[in-house]
């Protein structure tokens, strides 16, 4: 029987900068029941606080609701593991909520084949930002990435769309059914999951771009 091993806070995520959750990995338990507590203070403060919610994020997590979440302030947090034989502390983790946003996938993905008379045909892809993200305030810049592939192909073709919410693709295989998905990330932050796939049938007379 031993004191617990050193835990590690390995991930923090926020869906929208209004709330966030951090997760830790326990160290070895030393063969004894072990209690974990997360304590934190904000940059410039000395007063320590305990995690406000150990439940919402699941096991080995701490959830910070709206009233506990401040943008532009660094949180300095650590996890304490304690059993009958002693305690161990994780390294301190410095967290700025602005940098840990992982948004929901983009919405309303629409895909259409356009065949203008005077120009080459193209695939037109359009989408909307996730609803939880408020782009109007200027706090967020969302970047988008599109991936597509013929239904039976193994490899995805990836296009970076920057900040735009529509995109044109010229080079496609005629007669193929394509899957199209889009995802987004804040300028600092994490990629969302891919949106649900939208399928589009490319007409047989679609002219391949040179």
């Amino acid at each position: 029987q031993l004191p617990p091993g050193k835990p590690e806070i390995f991930k923090c995520r926020s869906p929208n900068k209004e709330t966030f959750t951090c997760w830790w990995r326990p160290g070895t338990d030393g063969g004894l029941p072990t209690n974990y507590s997360l304590t934190y203070h904000r940059e410039g403060e000395t007063l320590m606080h305990e995690c406000p919610d150990y439940i919402t994020g699941g096991p080995n997590s701490c959830h910070f609701g709206k009233q506990y979440t401040s943008m532009w302030r660094t949180y300095i947090m650590m996890v304490n593991a304690t059993n009958q034989m002693g305690s161990s502390f994780s390294d301190e983790l410095y967290v700025d909520v602005t940098y840990i946003v992982q948004p929901d996938p983009p919405l309303e993905l629409a895909v259409e084949v356009k065949q203008p008379e005077d120009r080459k045909p193209y695939l037109w892809i359009k989408w909307s930002p996730p609803t939880l993200i408020d782009l109007k305030t200027g706090w967020f810049t969302l970047l988008y990435e599109i991936r597509l592939k013929p239904e039976k192909a193994a490899e995805w073709e990836i296009h970076f769309a920057g900040q735009q919410t529509e995109f044109k693709i010229l080079s496609l295989h005629p007669g193929q059914k394509y899957l199209v998905q889009v995802r987004c990330k804040p300028d600092h932050g994490y990629w969302s999951a891919w949106s649900p796939a939208t399928f589009i049938q490319i007409p047989s007379d679609f002219t391949m771009n040179d």
Partner: antibody, heavy 120, light 107 residues
């Protein structure tokens, strides 16, 4: 204990490439951005770029955009910086540096440095 | 890019005295400034982040202040191990940039 251990010194010819490695231990590699900074002999520090090991998303100093390539190998917790078309002015100590937290780009842990000498 | 200008280039101070190092940004950077110490043959060591916050384990004799474009690192009472080169760094906008350094030497 957090450690960043870099590969050994290199001597390269002008026009060639160099690839410096940085093996991380003591923390979850994918949690923190990794940065690369260089220091020419007797000079100050110059930021080359940064990479997020969780998804290999990277940002570069425009000065190095066309010549530097940052990559990671998650299976070995190793970051790499490749610099191509080397010239004598690229002679410097190259450092990897871990982001201080999940936040802005200040650097709390540094590798020991790798001296790259470019000479004909 | 934002240019960080440090002064003086060299500062000669006696042990136990106070050292004040200056760093000026060419554009507004808020408090997005860090300070590092570097000794010969070693990698830099983080001292201060967010202009005024001491990093874990850094002695209280090191303090940072300033916001906007003017920043100061103060070492209240220089110890023998503090003689080194000090760099400021801004992380307000890409590319992240460092000052040219201030060498603190024994008077």
């Amino acid at each position: 204990e957090v450690q960043l251990v870099q590969s050994g010194a290199e001597v390269k010819k002008p026009g060639s490439s160099v690839k410096v490695s940085c093996k991380a231990s003591g923390y979850t590699f994918t949690t923190y951005w990794m940065h690369w900074v260089r220091q020419a002999p007797g000079q100050g520090l110059e930021w080359i770029g940064e990479i997020d090991p969780s998804d290999s998303y990277s940002n570069y100093n425009q000065k190095f955009k066309d010549r530097a390539t940052l990559t990671v190998d998650k299976s070995t917790s190793t970051a790499y910086m490749e610099l191509s078309s080397l010239r004598s002015e690229d002679t410097a100590v190259y450092y990897c540096a871990r982001n201080g937290g999940l936040g802005p780009a200040w650097f709390s842990y540094w590798g020991q440095g790798t001296l790259v000498t470019v000479s004909s | 890019e934002i240019v960080m200008t440090q002064s003086p280039a060299t500062l000669s101070v006696s042990p136990g005295e106070r050292a004040t190092l200056s760093c000026k940004a060419s554009q507004y950077v808020g408090t997005a400034v860090a300070w590092y110490q570097q000794k010969p043959g070693q990698a830099p060591r983080l001292l201060i982040y967010s202009a005024s916050n001491r990093y874990t384990g850094i002695p209280a004799r090191f303090s940072g202040s300033g916001s906007g474009t003017e920043f100061t690192l103060t070492i209240s009472s220089l110890q023998s191990e503090d003689f080194a080169v000090y760099y400021c760094q801004q992380y307000s906008s890409y590319p992240w940039t460092f000052g040219g350094g201030t060498k603190v030497e024994i008077k």
